[in-house]
Interface confidence: low
């Protein structure tokens, strides 16, 4: 008769690699007497004999997973016990291998030049797939702008025109390679003027051709403005080549003028615009003009960057040693004063101050600043900032401010031109036009000074909705 013998596992479990949907088998060969009872665990949890995903054969020595799933990854142990000595155990890992699979493929993208583009490419697979990208027919190389993120997505900083094209992502591991569909990255470019029209000083009755060249994606359209209005005379010739539009305006000169070329293109629902201006002066006229007290230039400060119209020409007063910095310093100081005002007042006051310190400029023969329209100034003073304005004037009267209103570079509304007299002689504040549409009621406002000198000024108690002085359409 055989002597009892404690179980010994003669074939320890090993790591098993298996592909998803394939069969995986663990073998646990045991020598013992009497025959042992063999149980199996996965991650220390007992595998039930009746679980149909498994097949246990050869007296429990063979465990087969009939169709491997992702979630079957783990540590499998066989435990053999026959009552003689202790139970013995052997463990091995199941590594579920998976060919690469792209779970979130890239999609077509339209992006504006200079912005950041992200093309997604989320993958699955074991070993973890490496993700690379192909542009056109070539592997895409990473650089300071272009990077493949940990997630597999492609990130392009400061997108350039040359980034446009067809892209696909490639997921690769030792078991295979997966390709996404080709997707298109379209780069849209804001309208930009490549060649601005040149200014001319000509004799009366001359012909002048002003040329303006612009680029953009989509190709911009070019329109011409004469002294703020659509060009009334002259002929325009246009040609388009390689996304560049060339427009030539031929004029018969009988009066001086400021001619502005406006290039516009559309990005979704939004438009981008670039402007360039040139003056046409008549030789005899310019002799009598006085010396300019300032110059027109693009605003390149920071404080009013979000308030002033993009690329607008503003007036810099050359009575300051360094006009740009002097005016920027003034507005910076004013900005700090505005920190304490109400949320209703602040943006209106910012719009007023920025447009007052950096007035729209007509280059012309003599650069001319365009003041804010009186009605807009009054709207800020008597509506948006009524309380603040009154408090400020009260402190000035009581001598609390050495120079009263001059602490803030605030215009004197009564001295500004009215838009009702000449709508082209003054500047509107678009912010107030926008707010006006969204305002229904306001508290009554008491005017802080007599209104006799201001045409159309409302009676001392007024509501925004009915006051003709605030009509801004």
């Amino acid at each position: 008769e055989k002597l009892p013998k404690a179980p010994v596992i003669t074939t320890p479990l090993e790591t098993v690699d298996a592909l998803v949907e394939e069969v995986a088998t663990f073998m646990c060969a045991v020598e013992s007497y009497p025959q042992p009872e063999i149980s199996w665990t996965r991650n220390k949890i007992l595998i039930k004999l009746f679980d149909t995903r498994y097949s246990i054969r050869e007296n429990g020595q063979l465990l087969t997973i009939l169709s491997v799933e992702d979630s079957d990854d783990g540590i499998y142990c066989c435990i053999a016990n026959n009552g003689v000595g202790g139970a013995v155990e052997s463990c091995g890992a199941l590594q579920v291998k998976m060919k690469p699979k792209i779970t979130r493929p890239p999609i077509n993208v339209k992006i504006i030049e200079g912005l950041k583009a992200v093309l997604p490419c989320t993958t699955m697979g074991n070993p973890k797939p490496s993700v690379s990208w192909i542009k056109g027919d070539n592997a895409l190389r990473e650089n300071s702008r272009i990077a493949v993120l940990e997630s597999g997505s492609l990130r392009i900083h400061n997108v350039q025109k040359e980034d446009a094209g067809q892209y696909r992502c490639v997921a690769k591991n030792s078991l295979g390679t997966a390709y996404s569909k080709l997707v298109k990255l379209e780069v849209e470019v804001f309208a930009r003027i490549l060649r601005a029209p040149e200014s001319h000083n000509v004799t009366f009755g001359s012909f002048v051709t002003l040329r303006c060249t612009a680029i953009g994606i989509p190709v911009p359209t070019i329109s011409w403005i004469e002294n703020g209005n659509a060009v009334s005379s002259g002929s325009i010739q246009e040609s388009v080549k390689d996304r560049v539009i060339d427009s030539r305006l031929q004029l018969f000169i009988t009066k001086p003028g400021l001619y502005t070329c406006i290039a516009t293109n559309k990005h979704g629902e939004k438009f981008s615009t670039a402007k360039a201006a040139a003056t046409v002066s008549i030789a005899e006229w310019s002799k009598s003009q006085k010396d300019s007290q300032g110059y027109c230039a693009q605003y390149r400060g920071e404080v009013c960057d979000a308030v002033l119209a993009k690329d607008a020409l503003v007036f810099f007063n050359t009575s300051y040693r360094d006009p740009e910095d002097a005016q920027e310093l003034l507005i910076h100081t004013a900005w700090n004063e505005l920190k304490a005002v109400s949320p209703l007042c602040r943006p209106a006051a910012e719009a007023l101050l920025c447009n007052h310190l950096f007035q729209e400029c007509s280059p012309g023969v003599v650069p001319t600043p365009m003041p804010i329209c009186r009605e807009y100034c009054l709207a800020v003073k008597e509506l948006f900032c009524a309380k603040e304005w009154q408090a400020m004037e009260g402190k000035a009267h009581r001598g609390l401010y050495r120079s009263g209103m001059h602490l803030l570079p605030v215009p004197e509304c009564s001295k500004l031109p009215s838009m009702h007299r000449d709508p082209t002689a003054c500047t509107r504040l678009p912010y107030l036009d926008y707010k006006k549409e969204n305002i229904t009621t306001f508290p009554s406002i008491t005017s802080s000074r007599p209104s006799a000198d201001i045409p159309n000024l409302p009676a001392s108690t007024s509501s925004f909705a009915v006051s003709p002085a605030y009509s801004m359409t």
Partner: antibody
Framework: ELQLVESGGGLVQPGGSLRLSCAAS????????MSWVRQAPGKGLEWVSA????????YYKESVKGRFTISRDNAKKTLYLQMNSLKSEDTAVYYC??????????????WGQGTLVTVSS | QAVVTQEPSLSVSPGGTVTLTCGLS?????????PDWYQQTPGQAPRTLIY???SRHSGVPSRFSGSISGNKAALTITGAQPEDEADYYC????????????FGGGTKLTVL
């Protein structure tokens, strides 16, 4: 006397990093925009980066964008340029320069003596 | 990307007048480019001469003047001196985005 003194240059391998500093004295540092300008051996001047008086925005030459970072510590009167992923073409004398006013793009009206950065393996 | 162009070299006799120009490969230089001019002698840091087209920096002799002529910025030295022999760089403000402030390649001025 207005002074700008650069430091932090040296020899570094491609892909390495350096941090340049520019100590300012003799003027109200936080009232001026500042810039870094470089000059490769035997070559011309090349604007690299700019920052306004308040550090509220930063500007970079296209080829250094994403690799270089300009910053300033107004309390310490110091301008910095953190340079990462250095390339051989970044080899140059780096000048710290003061702008003529608060904005980032006033003229450069005062210059340091420069610090040499050599990127080589 | 616009390139700022300058004459590689120019020469002038002592006491003579010379004009250095600064152009754009595409388009004209305008006052909105705020042309600045810098002088550099060998082994020295640059020195500011002219800023914003025609403003002379403090301490710069009156023989240096700046202007915009035609479609270029210009630096004129009237009554050149031997110490004016140097490299001269112009720089233009190019607006928002990248490469906002761009230097020209420089002009080597020889005072013969």
């Amino acid at each position: 006397e207005l002074q700008l003194v650069e430091s932090g240059g040296g020899l570094v391998q491609p892909g390495g990093s350096l941090r340049l500093s520019c100590a300012a004295s003799g003027f109200t540092f936080d009232d001026y925009g500042m810039s870094w300008v470089r000059q490769a051996p035997g070559k011309g001047l090349e604007w690299v980066s700019a920052i306004p008086w308040n550090g509220g925005s930063t500007y970079y030459k296209e080829s250094v964008k994403g690799r270089f970072t300009i910053s300033r510590d107004n309390a310490k009167k110091t301008l910095y340029l953190q340079m990462n992923s250095l390339k051989s073409e970044d080899t140059a004398v780096y000048y710290c320069a003061k702008r003529s006013g608060r904005i980032a793009f006033g003229a450069l009206d005062a210059w340091g003596q420069g610090t040499l950065v050599t990127v080589s393996s | 990307q616009a390139v700022v162009t300058q004459e590689p070299s120019l020469s002038v006799s002592p006491g003579g007048t010379v004009t250095l120009t600064c152009g754009l490969s595409s388009g004209s230089v305008t006052s909105s480019n705020y042309p600045d001019w810098y002088q550099q002698t060998p082994g020295q840091a640059p020195r500011t001469l002219i800023y914003t087209t025609n403003s002379r920096h403090s301490g710069v002799p009156s023989r240096f003047s700046g202007s915009i002529s035609g479609n270029k910025a210009a630096l004129t030295i009237t009554g050149a001196q031997p110490e004016d022999e140097a490299d001269y760089y112009c720089a233009l403000y190019m607006g928002g985005g990248s490469n906002v402030y761009v230097f020209g390649g420089g002009t080597k001025l020889t005072v013969l």
